[in-house]
Amino acid sequence: ADRAALEELVRLQGAHVRGLKEQKASAEQIEEEVTKLLKLKAQLGQDEGKQKFVLKTPKGTRDYSPRQMAVREKVFDVIIRCFKRHGAEVIDTPVFELKETLTGKYGEDSKLIYDLKDQGGELLSLRYDLTVPFARYLAMNKLTNIKRYHIAKVYRRDNPAMTRGRYREFYQCDFDIAGQFDPMIPDAECLKIMCEILSSLQIGNFLVKVNDRRILDGMFAVCGVPDSKFRTICSSVDKLDKVSWEEVKNEMVGEKGLAPEVADRIGDYVQQHGGVSLVEQLLQDPKLSQNKQAVEGLGDLKLLFEYLILFGIDDKISFDLSLARGLDYYTGVIYEAVLLQMPTQAGEEPLGVGSIAAGGRYDGLVGMFDPKGRKVPCVGLSIGVERIFSIVEQRLEASEEKVRTTETQVLVASAQKKLLEERLKLVSELWDAGIKAELLYKKNPKLLNQLQYWEEAGIPLVAIIGEQELRDGVIKLRSVASREEVDVRREDLVEEIRRRTNQPLSTC
């Protein structure tokens, strides 16, 4: 009876989760109900005695199919080209770091770090992002100047809503500029890079929200927030893109013990967003203008906007006082790019549908690793590629566009039996000439099967060997696009394939 009841509950809870998804309930609500469903299923499993081993990837991870990899490679290509265009070098660091390296760098997010089980040696943790390892790398190598990019997987013990492109193992694409430079020039370049990449990817309209940690801290100070509560109130403010001010206020007052009038004063500020005119307006604010930190931050933002205008991206940037990125290491400018969903009603503002890139200035992080506390100013950005992959994949599915998963230029086929040796010789010649070529691994494949494979794989050309053609010293070259078939002299084949696939001269 107990098992039957549990089974019914699993069925009901499953239907409940599906219903919530259809109603487009909040991610957190869906996540909680999915967690409940998993707990119910686990109880069912325990009830069976020994649980059956289910073949699956761990929670929050996924495999990439060839189609998904093709999408991913294209996205990475756009990003890497942009990073290189801006003169970045590339580095790599270990997937795991000493636990101590990551400790105390992420504030409230530290609970999401994966610690490795102690094997009797060093205490290790999987990297949570690429920024802290970068700071460790700079300090360790006593570097004071570098412009680098780093693309690698990071690990977070989040409870991810994987449908929204969030995972426990995911790629980050980081670009950072380390060094002592004149204010806001590297910061502006980071924003320019972010805009270039997001525009190139053509994933839709986006907006980059900009703020400054010093403005936030100054604002909290003038509003009467105790120093000890700055960071925790910051994380509440950062939720404003997801929940209403009322809910944020309730959290500040009810859970974090802030006085309601202090919360109201914060509310007057954090609900404002605009451009350079808002920066100027706040510089005149009777309270903020008396706070040194806030004035410094506002002064830098004013300068930043001047550079953004010169870079031609000021229309993509919004100064948003509610932006309060959760990581503890930011010290100056912070920014976050969100994809915009166009408004359903005329006159409404476009709606942000999740962060796709973010970053900021972190001048103190390297100093945390330096025995003498020497600081190396840094500013950088991170592209949220997993979310971008999801968006691109969804778009491709909707358009039913065919995605090529190989780069093969030509399939080597034969029209008659007993021509395996000739096919092997020809495909080898093509490989040696740097042509991407394939053949079917059968001694006597049917021509129809070969042509079917050629079409399905989206290979542009097929080279068909026949007995007559061999005698005449030619190969039939057929194009998938034009359907035309031409006889090409064997010695001209490589050149003809190159010409038809616009491939420059290259060898292995």
């Epitope: 509950l9 909680e32 967690t35 119910l40 409870n159």
Partner: antibody, heavy 120, light 107 residues
């Protein structure tokens, strides 16, 4: 056997605070969602708040949100309800209750209740 | 919030009688409904969960049925210990709400 024992109730003036505790035994406390349900004298039952097994999720009814805070200490097998800015309408017997099958919002085990009286 | 309405608010019956109490939800709640029994000065006791499942240790004279918005608790043959107040509760969405109660009295 499953046992839930509430404590911390009493008489308090409007605007005052109280902290209710619930000691759990006889089951793996850290596996279960837990809740506080109250019943005003001579009235019906009202679900006040709940907390998930690992404290990731908490919810409150509109009447108490911003004033009450639910928390738990799995190491001590204890559930708590911090009640601030108390009002006369918060007067009730407060029951600590365990979720059915760990996660279903139906209370399959209840404490004996602790009376909270808010009066000047 | 989902409103739960019980009827009747009180009922008088004798030992051996068959008694039916109904509960209506203001919107569909699938089978997310429970029935509780409460005696004066005591905590409620779970009788039925997800509309029709009998909680272990509860006598089989208690049964539940319904789905969507209309639900029923039936006691097939009243026993002296069954005189109490009965509550229904929806567990579909927070805030989880109870009916106003049905008092079952001795005739």
């Amino acid at each position: 056997q499953v046992q839930l024992v509430e404590s911390g109730g009493g008489l308090v003036k409007p605007g005052g605070s109280l902290r209710l505790s619930c000691a759990a035994s006889g089951f793996t406390f850290s596996d279960y969602y837990m809740s506080w349900i109250r019943q005003a004298p001579g009235k019906g039952l009202e679900w006040v708040s709940y907390i998930s097994d690992k404290s990731r999720y908490t919810k409150y009814t509109d009447k108490v949100r911003g004033r009450f805070t639910i928390s738990r200490d799995n190491a001590k097998n204890s559930l708590y309800l911090q009640m601030n800015s108390l009002r006369a309408e918060d007067t009730a017997v407060y029951y600590c209750a365990r979720y059915l099958y760990q996660v279903i919002a139906i209370a399959d085990a209840w404490g004996q209740g602790t009376l909270v009286t808010v009066s000047s | 919030d989902i409103q739960m309405t019980q009827s009747p608010s009180s009922v008088s019956a004798s030992v051996g009688d068959r008694v039916t109490i109904t509960c209506r939800a203001s919107q569909g709640i699938s089978s997310w409904l429970a029935w509780f029994q409460q005696k004066p000065g005591k905590a409620p006791k779970l009788l039925i969960f997800v509309a029709s499942n009998l909680e272990s240790g509860v006598p089989s004279r208690f049964s539940g049925s319904g789905s969507g918005t209309d639900f029923t608790l039936t006691i097939s043959s009243l026993q002296p210990e069954d005189f109490a107040t009965y509550y229904c509760q929806q567990a579909e969405s927070f805030p989880y709400t109870f009916g106003q109660g049905t008092k079952l009295e001795i005739k």
